[in-house]
């Protein structure tokens, strides 16, 4: 049997059953999530659920830039350090940079400091690039 790999929307990249879109536009976290959702197909700010997924994403983004942090779909909606993925995925894989999680920083970004392999918390109203994800 020939198994066809699902195709992603133009400009999105495919990895292990998911499509990813890297937006080099500045949005706060909630506006970024709304823009992801506007693409349908269950798109959200990206969940990153394994080192392999993190490495693939980091390698892709490094082909575009190496200095700007990027919003992902991890947030702390109750502001109690109870982090969760906006797409409902289980919060098992973690890749925090080790920076302080205090203050009013309840949204997560991929940090450029470690080639996008680790995350930092940041204030959700900051305008940054963002990464969307959906399953085709």
């Amino acid at each position: 049997d020939i198994i066809m790999r699902p195709s992603c929307a133009p400009g999105w990249f495919y990895h292990k059953s998911n499509c990813y879109g890297y937006f080099r536009k500045l949005r706060n976290w909630s506006d970024a999530e709304l823009e992801c959702q506007s693409y349908g197909n269950g798109a959200h700010l990206a969940s990153i659920l394994s080192l392999k997924e993190a490495s693939t994403i980091a390698e892709y983004i490094s082909g575009y830039q190496r200095s700007q942090p990027i919003w992902i779909g991890l947030h702390d909606p109750q502001k109690r350090q109870q982090w969760q993925w906006i797409d409902g995925a289980m919060y098992l894989y973690r890749s925090w940079s080790g920076k302080s999680m205090g203050g009013n920083k309840h949204c997560a970004e991929m940090s450029s400091n470690n080639n996008f392999l680790t995350w930092s918390s940041n204030e959700c109203n900051k305008r940054q690039h963002f990464l969307c994800k959906y399953r085709p």
Epitope: A9, P10, G11, W12, G21, Y22, F23, R24, K25, L26, G63, Y64, Q65, S67, Q68
Partner: antibody, heavy 120, light 109 residues
């Protein structure tokens, strides 16, 4: 007031090199990249490359790789663009334009342009 | 990728004109689109940045938009004036490269 002041017109022979300068004032030089854009007579805008005065990173248009070098001198807030092995089709107005580092939102101030004529 | 613009457009004073800018591949919404005006003999100036934002000093007759379905950006100029005549260029990004459209000559009849 932000200003980008470019050097004067140049006439060069084929095979020669030209170095155009762009002196910036009115803002923090290292906070903005400098792009170089050229426009041949009667033609559109062609992006040549970009340099960051902050860390000296450069990106050049593939078409010009190997012939162009962009540099900056932070002590004088001046950017330079050198183009080597000139050909007649390099005849153009050369513009410098600033772009906020990491912004991806375009070129908000431009120099007035430097006409480079390549003729034997 | 490439950004394709119509070679020329013309319209009468007071009317509205729209100039399109179509991306040949990828997703135009991934990057900001800018628009530049160039009057004869002058350097370009930015009239729209970040898809639809007017820099200070640009009249509100100028507006920008993105149409994801056609993978294109548009510049709309309403209440056309003679001073709007000139060349208009869209600009966006592809990885580390900055990309310009081929330019559109606007003639105000």
């Amino acid at each position: 007031e932000v200003q980008l002041v470019q050097s004067g017109a140049e006439v060069k022979k084929p095979g020669a090199s030209v170095k155009v300068s762009c002196k910036a004032s009115g803002y923090t030089f290292t906070s903005y990249g400098i792009n170089w854009v050229r426009q041949a007579p009667g033609q559109g805008l062609e992006w040549m490359g970009w340099i960051s005065p902050y860390n000296y990173n450069t990106n050049y248009a593939q078409k010009l790789q190997g012939r162009v070098t962009m540099t900056t001198d932070t002590s004088t807030s001046t950017a330079y663009m050198e183009l080597r092995s000139l050909r007649s089709d390099d005849t153009a107005v050369y513009y410098c334009a600033r772009e906020e580092t990491g912004s991806y939102h375009g070129f908000d101030y431009w120099g007035r342009g430097t006409l480079v004529t390549v003729s034997s | 990728f490439m950004l394709t613009q119509p070679h020329s457009v013309s319209e009468s004073p007071g009317k509205t004109v729209t100039i399109s800018c179509t991306a040949s591949s990828g997703n135009i919404a991934f990057n900001y689109v800018q628009w530049y005006q160039q009057r004869p003999g002058s350097a370009p100036t930015i009239v729209i940045q970040e898809d639809n934002q007017r820099p200070s000093g640009v009249p509100d007759r100028f507006s920008g938009s993105i149409d994801r379905s056609s993978n294109s950006a548009s510049l709309t100029i309403s209440g056309l004036k003679a001073e709007d005549e000139g060349d208009y260029y869209c600009q966006s990004y592809d990885k580390y490269y900055r990309i310009f459209g081929g330019g559109t000559k606007l003639t105000v009849l």
